[in-house]
């Protein structure tokens, strides 16, 4: 899947664009909004009716090296009495993000963009029930 | 930056960390090509904290289309199908990395950008405080 070229309907390519070899692109990995932080203080992963845990995956050949994945704690959802209700389902909510993958081929190094599917949290859903005919 | 293991047989590189600027293959390695959450599941409708999905489009960004969730209700849907306002629907937010064209409008020059997106909603139990 290639990154789409800038459409001429939007704008013309400026003269100031850096020269880039064919089949590749220049990527500055100094992140814009690097210091932006999600407010994790809300602690919703424990207070949700479909609670979840976090696991940190670490890969030294990936940028960023740390990716946090959520896993639903229960199959069912937590009811008002604090008990698990198996008639409902805790399900993962997922979101794609981009990472840069570093690949070693002998002594040379190349970089590849990769889409990674991250499980962000869980939500409680009503299942669609099918009875035997 | 991050430290990476070097092949001991290779000449010493000047930096063990990721360089600030890299040349990247235009092809994105990925199995998950479905970026429209409406097609991937109907959780947004069947959740006890359902949400609507809003399309955010920006031609200067890759991916140019990002779907943002907005909780449909303040409360959560109970077993009777009614909204229970003693519970709360809250957004689940996630920081993701996208590509920003830099300089602007350039077809093959980008910078990583971190953005905060609401991915969906979950139902939470509040701590209740009655008047003393």
């Amino acid at each position: 899947r290639k990154i789409p070229k800038v459409g001429h309907t939007f704008f013309q390519k400026p003269e100031s664009c850096p020269p880039v070899p064919g089949g590749s692109m220049k990527l500055d990995i100094g992140i814009i909004n690097e210091n932006q932080r999600v407010s994790m203080s809300r602690n919703i992963e424990s207070r949700s009716t479909s609670p979840w845990n976090y696991t940190v995956t670490w890969d030294p050949n990936r940028y960023p090296s740390e990716v946090v994945q959520a896993q639903c704690r229960n199959l069912g959802c937590i009811n008002a009495q604090g008990k698990e209700d198996i008639s409902m389902n805790s399900v993962p909510i997922q979101q794609e993000t981009l990472v840069v993958r570093r690949k070693h081929q002998g002594c040379s190094v190349s970089f590849q963009l990769e889409k990674v599917l991250v499980t962000v949290g869980c939500t409680c859903v009503t299942p669609v029930i099918h009875h035997v005919q | 930056g991050i430290t990476i293991p070097r092949n001991p047989g290779c000449p010493n590189s000047e930096d063990k960390n990721f360089p600030r600027t890299v040349m990247v293959n235009l092809n994105i390695h990925n199995r998950n090509t479905n970026t429209n959450p409406k097609r991937s599941s109907d959780y947004y409708n069947r959740s006890t904290s359902p949400w609507n999905l809003h399309r955010n489009e920006d031609p200067e960004r890759y991916p140019s289309v990002i779907w943002e969730a907005k909780c449909r209700h303040l409360g959560c849907i109970n077993a009777d199908g009614n909204v229970d306002y003693h519970m709360n629907s809250v957004p689940i937010q996630q920081e993701i990395l996208v590509l920003r064209r830099e300089p602007p409008h350039c077809p093959n020059s980008f910078r990583l950008e971190k953005i905060l997106v609401s991915v969906g909603c979950t139902c939470v139990t509040p701590i209740v405080h009655h008047v003393a």
Epitope: S41, R42, N43 | L74, H86, N88, V90, V124, P126, I127
Partner: nanobody, 120 residues
């Protein structure tokens, strides 16, 4: 802690109007929502209307839609309930609430309530 002070209740004739006010003070820097429930004698406390702080979206119980309007004043951290075309079944104690994000949890705070009586 968050304190809620309601005002504006009273006796009104059927078809009349009232404007209820609720002002929040204390740790209200991260309000999620504010609104109103009501409780008639011998009945459960029922949701009336609320407003979400992040985007100003308003939510109403079916029984008051088209007659009641909720609004807010961000600077004063206050909500208002404009009640028109009042009916006898609107008689109740109207209780203000606020959902506030704390350091580790979302908290629901209740006010004392203000009496609304609709009678001729």
């Amino acid at each position: 802690e968050v304190q809620l002070v309601e005002s504006g209740g009273g006796l009104v004739q059927p078809g009349g109007s009232l404007r209820l006010s609720c002002a929040a003070s204390g740790r209200t820097f991260s309000t999620h929502a504010m609104g109103w429930f009501r409780q008639a004698p011998g009945k459960e406390r029922d949701f009336v209307a609320a407003i979400r702080w992040s985007d100003g979206s308003s939510f109403y119980a079916d029984s008051v839609k088209g007659r009641f309007t909720i609004s807010r004043d961000n600077a004063k951290n206050a909500v208002y309930l404009q009640s028109n075309s009042l009916k006898s079944e609107d008689t109740a104690v109207y209780v203000c609430y606020a959902d506030v994000e704390g350091p580790t949890a979302l908290h629901k705070y209740w006010g004392r309530g203000t009496q609304v009586t609709v009678s001729s």
